[in-house]
Interface confidence: low
């Protein structure tokens, strides 16, 4: 319905706590190197000039649209071209076009510090002294490093930061208390930000058809219960919520996200049983908790796929009628009969049958040539299947520090032109799959390990497209969505890639190398290991396995030494020496 | 990730000197080799100098290798150009940059960026 002021309409729909939030979260997504305080500035003004068109809708500049409004607003940033370069000309241009503009300059890897956690006692005065502001610059440095983190969720992870905060400060123990809350909120927020992106990413580099194929399946599979009719309605709505946000339109999607909680729990019956607590939850754990719900069980008496999508004699009929719509509800029946398929396999079999009939339904004789179109669907599924017992397998036997090794070892000699620390933490995140997944029983692992492989090289992808360097990474990424992971896998040694000359440099380490965490320690010797493999990429596993582990043991030897300075540099030359022998650099 | 913010650029007459610094915050300039470059106006940027992590390794454009020198100071997290017999081509804006652990032959082999600073030489 339109609305004679929809920033009046979002304002009075949200409320003024969240629509602040949301306008900070907009604006630190846009402008990621503006100061705090000058985000603080903006929002403030959008609000009291919201709070003007609530008053009064006819009022001057409330009937503009939210993107002009917001675009408005951004362009009169004083330091737009010295901070920004070349995104102060979107300012010369028009809705939508300036939007468009805006969102292309969105940093996937912005030049901002790592955020550094102060002492707690530090931050549990500044929570108690000014918990508006302290909330407000959660926001702002989440927004600013995650510029496509899915902005209502954000909301729910700063009510959960508040709630730490507030528990914890007036605990005996602050830190026990607090550290662990942080350190689980830091790790989902990465998670969260990172399955966003691959939202974000599927929508704007594979279109809405890509992105609603994965919400029919995913939904399909959690709600096995639920009619094809309820299955793409919420499809529907979830398109546009996420389009919207992945738009920059986070008002109107935290809006849209509350209306389509609000329809799934008043509608709880034809959709899931597993929704009952979610939906007595408050707006933003109900949100989450239904996006995180298990799988509802599967109904007892579906029949065979085969009758509607290959033995039928209306096949042809029916996909020619209407092909999106037969095709989805092939997806859904196979998704709702197969919660121990990854999305992206069962993408792939949605795919396989479309090619199919397309090709047979021209033909003379179209079911004998679909006829057993179900047979090519065996080596896809066992593909990934075998892929996962293997690198199981491998994860139960190396630990996951050495399972990320050989992670890195494998993706470097794969595509070494790739910046040392992308490889090193897109590997390390890869590595991961094993703690995550193989844990599961084998009906559970697929899922979770293939599809949060999806997630992870949707990271290389975006990070990669922003200075590319590889051809192979470029193909594997535009190629297809639901084959960038074999389409990896099936990189072999990157034959053409001239080795980098070796620099004794790029393996001198120093003292402070013993203060580090373990994390960060390991990223230095995972370093190492990535620059040693792109100048011996013919390395042998035996070999690289030798050399790290002299490395490993000249670290703790100098750790341990009194002058450890000295020991550094001294060992250091006899590793780098011993190391160029032992691999005939 | 890394913020890297140059400074001490200016106006300086032919035969000046000046001395640039490369700050590093939120990250330990150790692990990090620094590169200079400059981009004068309408020209592609170029390297001028760059220091490998350790400081054992360094390397000089022939237009500014004996006027220029590049060091480090690891414990202010701090890379320095000083630039002697500075001339009116030097003119440009000066920017460092970060490569983990050493010195790259191409620009975009750098992963991190200062936002520059600018030299004017002219009398």
């Known amino acids: 319905d339109a609305h004679k002021s929809e920033v009046a309409h979002r304002f009075k729909d949200l409320g003024e706590e969240n629509f602040k939030a949301l306008v900070l979260i907009a604006f630190a997504q846009y402008l990621q190197q503006c100061p705090f305080e000058d985000h603080v500035k903006l929002v403030n003004e959008v609000t009291e000039f919201a709070k003007t068109c609530v008053a009064d809708e006819s009022a001057e500049n409330c009937d503009k649209s939210l993107h002009t409004l917001f675009g408005d607003k951004l362009c009169t940033v004083a330091t737009l071209r010295e901070t920004y370069g070349e995104m102060a000309d979107c300012c010369a241009k028009q809705e939508p076009e300036r939007n468009e503009c805006f969102l292309q300059h969105k940093d996937d890897n912005p030049n901002l510090p790592r955020l550094v956690r102060p002492e707690v006692d530090v931050m549990c005065t500044a929570f108690h002294d000014n918990e508006e502001t302290f909330l407000k610059k959660y926001l702002y440095e989440i927004a600013r490093r995650h510029p496509y983190f899915y902005a209502p969720e954000l909301l729910f992870f700063a009510k959960r930061y508040k709630a730490a905060f507030t528990e914890c400060c007036q605990a005996a123990d602050k830190a026990a208390c607090l550290l662990p809350k942080l350190d689980e909120l830091r790790d989902e927020g990465k998670a969260s930000s990172a399955k966003q992106r691959l939202k974000c990413a599927s929508l704007q580099k594979f279109g809405e058809r890509a992105f609603k194929a994965w919400a029919v399946a995913r939904l399909s599979q959690r709600f096995p219960k639920a009619e094809f009719a309820e299955v793409s309605k919420l499809v529907t709505d979830l398109t546009k919520v996420h389009t919207e946000c992945c738009h920059g339109d986070l008002l109107e999607c935290a809006d849209d996200r509350a209306d389509l909680a609000k329809y799934i729990c008043e509608n709880q019956d034809s959709i899931s049983s597993k929704l009952k607590e979610c939906c007595e939850k408050p707006l933003l754990e109900k949100s989450h908790c239904i996006a995180e719900v298990e799988n509802d069980e599967m109904p007892a008496d579906l029949p065979s796929l085969a009758a509607d999508f290959v033995e039928s004699k209306d096949v042809c009929k029916n996909y020619a009628e209407a092909k999106d719509v037969f095709l989805g509800m092939f997806l859904y029946e196979y998704a709702r009969r197969h919660p121990d398929y990854s999305v992206v396999l069962l993408l792939r079999l949605a795919k396989t049958y479309e090619t199919t009939l397309e090709k047979c339904c021209a033909a003379a004789d179209p079911h004998e040539c679909y006829a057993k179109v179900f047979d090519e669907f065996k080596p896809l599924v066992e593909e990934p299947q075998n892929l996962i017992k293997q690198n199981c397998e491998l994860f139960e036997q190396l630990g996951e520090y050495k399972f990320q090794n050989a992670l890195l070892v494998r993706y470097t000699k794969k595509v070494p032109q790739v910046s040392t620390p992308t490889l090193v933490e897109v590997s390390r995140n890869l590595g991961k799959v094993g703690s995550k997944c193989c844990k599961h029983p084998e009906a559970k692992r697929m899922p979770c390990a293939e599809d949060y492989l999806s997630v992870v090289l949707n990271q290389l992808c975006v990070l990669h497209e922003k200075t590319p360097v590889s051809d192979r990474v470029t193909k594997c990424c535009t190629e297809s969505l639901v084959n960038r992971r074999p389409c990896f896998s099936a990189l072999e040694v990157d034959e053409t890639y001239v080795p980098k000359e070796f620099n004794a440099e790029t393996f001198t380490f120093h003292a402070d190398i013993c203060t580090l965490s373990e994390k960060e320690r390991q990223i230095k010797k995972q370093t190492a290991l990535v620059e040693l493999v792109k100048h011996k990429p013919k390395a042998t596993k035996e070999q690289l396995k030798a050399v790290m582990d002299d490395f490993a043991a000249f670290v703790e030897k100098c750790c341990k030494a009194d002058d450890k300075e000295t020991c550094f540099a001294e060992e250091g030359k006899k590793l780098v020496a011993a190391s160029q022998a032992a691999l005939g650099l | 990730e890394v913020q890297l913010l140059e400074s001490g650029g200016g106006l300086v007459q032919p035969g000046g000197s000046l001395r640039l610094s490369c700050a590093a915050s939120?990250?330990?300039?150790?692990?990090?080799?620094i590169g200079w470059f400059r981009q004068a106006p309408g020209k592609e940027r170029e390297g001028v100098s760059c220091?490998?992590?350790?400081?054992?390794?360094?390397n000089y454009a022939d237009s500014v290798k004996g006027r220029f020198t590049i060091s480090r100071d690891n414990s202010k997290n701090t890379v320095y150009l000083q630039m002697n017999s500075l001339k009116p081509e030097d003119t440009a804006v000066y920017y460092c940059?970060?490569?983990?652990?050493?010195?790259?032959?191409?620009?975009?082999?750098?992963?991190?960026w200062g936002q520059g600073t600018q030299v004017t030489v002219s009398s």
């Open positions: 940059a970060a490569a983990v652990l050493e010195c790259r032959t191409v620009v975009r082999g750098y992963d991190y």
């Open positions: 939120g990250f330990t300039l150790d692990y990090y080799a």
């Open positions: 220091i490998a992590s350790s400081g054992g390794s360094t």
